[in-house]
Amino acid sequence: QDVRVQVLPEVRGQLGGTVELPCHLLPPVPGLYISLVTWQRPDAPANHQNVAAFHPKMGPSFPSPKPGSERLSFVSAKQSTGQDTEAELQDATLALHGLTVEDEGNYTCEFATFPKGSVRGMTWLRVIAKPKNQAEAQKVTFSQDPTTVALCISKEGRPPARISWLSSLDWEAKETQVSGTLAGTVTVTSRFTLVPSGRADGVTVTCKVEHESFEEPALIPVTLSVRYPPEVSISGYDDNWYLGRTDATLSCDVRSNPEPTGYDWSTTSGTFPTSAVAQGSQLVIHAVDSLFNTTFVCTVTNAVGMGRAEQVIFVRETPNTAGAGATGG
């Protein structure tokens, strides 16, 4: 009956952690004697190729300084206790502790048997490092030029993490990769870039980080912060202002970041009706007269700049009953 070596084609281990490289001789055959078990790294330099051996009488040996005896152990293999019992070498699983990047590579597990001869199996050990992720908004100011408004950083991953963004905005991403402080790891930084405008302020975008150490992608929401001058509109005019009307109000509606620091009401004609009283963002009209046949201007200031809106007022002789509607205010 033929025997075979059962190994995993690939084993993944966490950088700094412990990994087991399974290796079993199957099936159990009466009279099949395992005289030696060895682990080798065929791709390593000649003096580092022999990683471990298990001699039924002498037990385990770990000759190479890398990984070295302090980081290697046979999980189940047992040497004979004195001369009366046979060594148990069918399970040659090797444990590797304190994984380093240099440990990555091919490992060959070999059983020297009698009478079948030597049989071997090869495992590829991949050393991975789970990255630490963070994302943050960059406080930016309104501009005509593309600017980084959010950063997503995946630190010290192996292999490098893949970063993408989920957003309905018009954006592009710029990615950089640098070596991590841990040897063999990579820190990936993705910059979410757009032309910063008020439309982007307060919008939540999502950084998506994918890595083989994650069961599912990491999704990190980021709320954008764009400083921009006030965007102003005026509400309250219902096209039914008539002489003598007493319940009219204009509101200066503003979107801005940061908050407005001042409101200024004026008219394009230069004359300002005395019955119109500015109360911050509101213009309260006590009584409509002919001076209201003008264009009102609301100018709003914040730390970034200013914005303005105009509202043309048409004063009627009598109320427009055909399209009676609610007054603004």
């Epitope: 030696l36 039924p56 009366d84 030597s118 071997r120």
Partner: antibody, heavy 116, light 107 residues
């Protein structure tokens, strides 16, 4: 401790047979193969074959297969190697040996001289 | 069968010398090679197994190297008690085969 004690020297005529014994002690006889290796005077080592006392399975070097029989008697923990049709080039020291990783335990050797 | 060709057949060296014996396999045997030392009138003793692993109790002046088809036994500083014959053996494939031996003489 493990011991392999072989039978004494033999002088044989060409064409005859010789049967060398190897008595084992100090371990579970049925758990290990007993191998036979020979060494002609002033020459190298040559593997002849082996027996597994646990199930009497045997394994031979093709060179000797037609002339050799290796057996084991578990009741006495003794292995035997019988070589027939002897010729002068079979003159050698014959060793029984126990494979524990390598050939770690050896009998003291039995000198077989084939001479007319 | 796999042939194990050993060289030289005889080696004469002085105490303190570094000496090497080589063994060439007729086909790839991995690292499945043993080196034995045999003194006159005695059975062989294991020095090195799996090509480079020193056997228990063997002085560290003995070392082995190689894989595939080419193997070397090195004695870093020859001692008088190293007078013996040295054999390589492959256990990669049945039947086991031995080199023809290297007789080491002390000058």
């Amino acid at each position: 401790q493990v011991q392999l004690v072989q039978s004494g020297a033999e002088v044989k005529k060409p064409g005859s047979s010789v049967k060398v014994s190897c008595k084992a002690s100090g371990y579970i006889f049925t758990s290990y193969w007993i191998h036979w290796v020979r060494q002609p005077p002033g020459k190298g080592l040559e593997w002849i074959g082996a027996v597994y006392p646990g199930n009497s399975d045997s394994n031979y070097n093709q060179k000797f297969k037609a002339r050799v029989t290796i057996t084991a008697v578990t009741s006495t923990s003794t292995a035997y190697m019988e070589l027939s049709s002897l010729r002068s080039e079979d003159t050698a020291v014959y060793y029984c040996t126990k494979l524990v990783g390598t050939f770690d335990y050896w009998g003291q050797g039995t000198t077989v001289t084939v001479s007319s | 069968d796999i042939q194990m060709t050993q060289s030289p057949s005889t080696l004469s060296a002085s105490v303190g010398d570094r000496v090497s014996v080589t063994c060439k396999a007729s086909q790839n045997v991995g690292i499945n090679v043993v080196w034995y030392q045999q003194k006159p009138g005695q059975p062989p003793k294991t020095l090195i197994y799996s090509a480079s692993y020193r056997y228990s109790g063997v002085p560290d002046r003995f070392s082995g190297s190689g894989s595939g088809t080419d193997f070397t036994l090195t004695i870093s500083s020859l001692q008088a008690e190293d007078l013996a014959e040295y054999f390589c053996q492959q256990y990669n494939t049945n039947p086991f085969t031995f080199g023809q031996g290297t007789k080491l003489e002390i000058k």
